[in-house]
């Protein structure tokens, strides 16, 4: 599934509306390992990879395409 990297750059959003903090309004139990799709405003967050949202930490995470590394998959992996 590529390299998964995480970044603390977030405003606590889970569902895509600036005024919402969806994690505070859902009844689900927050267990590590639960990923959700990143809200729409993160559409271009991952440069060379797929964005997914870490529900337990409310942070965007990038699953990098092969050959790319970095918090936002912005760097070429020279060892690839």
């Amino acid at each position: 599934d590529g390299n998964s990297t995480r970044s603390p750059e977030t405003n606590g959003l889970l569902c895509g509306d600036p005024e919402e903090n969806c994690a505070a309004t859902t009844t689900q139990s927050k267990r590590k390992g639960h990923f959700s799709r990143c809200p729409k405003q993160y559409k271009h967050y991952c440069i060379k990879g797929r964005c997914r949202f870490v529900v337990a930490e409310q942070t965007p995470s990038c699953v990098c395409d092969e050959g790319y590394i970095g918090a936002r998959c912005e760097r070429v992996d020279l060892f690839y």
Partner: antibody
Framework: EVQLLESGGGLVQPGGSLRLSCAAS????????MHWVRQAPGKGLEWVSS????????FYADSVKGRFTISRDNSKNTLYLQMNSLRAEDTAVYYC?????????????WGQGTLVTVSS | DIELTQPPSVSVSPGQTASITCSGD??????VHWYQQKPGQAPVLVIY???DRPSGIPERFSGSNSGNTATLTISGTQAEDEADYYC?????????FGGGTKLTVL
Amino acid sequence: EVQLLESGGGLVQPGGSLRLSCAASGFTFSDHAMHWVRQAPGKGLEWVSSIVYDGSNTFYADSVKGRFTISRDNSKNTLYLQMNSLRAEDTAVYYCARDYLDFGYYFDVWGQGTLVTVSS
Amino acid sequence: DIELTQPPSVSVSPGQTASITCSGDKIGKKYVHWYQQKPGQAPVLVIYDDSDRPSGIPERFSGSNSGNTATLTISGTQAEDEADYYCQAWDMQSVVFGGGTKLTVL
């Protein structure tokens, strides 16, 4: 071929229980979140429940919360919906659907549906 | 909770363009997906992520989403496009469907 096949529907009395199954084939079941969606006769689509890829988190519509339980067995490539305290308004065709990826995307594969009729 | 509102019915002549709307508060900030359902059949995804088309779906199907309205457009509508169409989005961690639109090809 990617396929979802529901089973377990039928006629049940109000207050009764039923367990639906959805057998998945043709893809890596454990990579995908799964969902149940229902459609009452002549009505539109209504989301029922969702479960993440490993079964650790589940989500329900208010209309079924506390009565229905979604689960999955990744070793059997099967999704389940345990329905208790059934009501007449639960009468519908129940579809299982695959999430494109881990959770929160779109429903790219649907089963053919299984009819649940709640009536005395 | 977000509500998605669709017109109950839309009529179009063969070869003409059909537009089906899906309205909801600030829906442009969410991804919207569209499903086609023919009588007695399961729904089929025809547009995802506002405007992307799955493989196997004809090019005449397109979508847009901005502000409070998402739109499914069928250009050069054919008789086989007659069906019910549903929009869908996520609200918090729940799935929301529009009420559906019956497209009639006259």
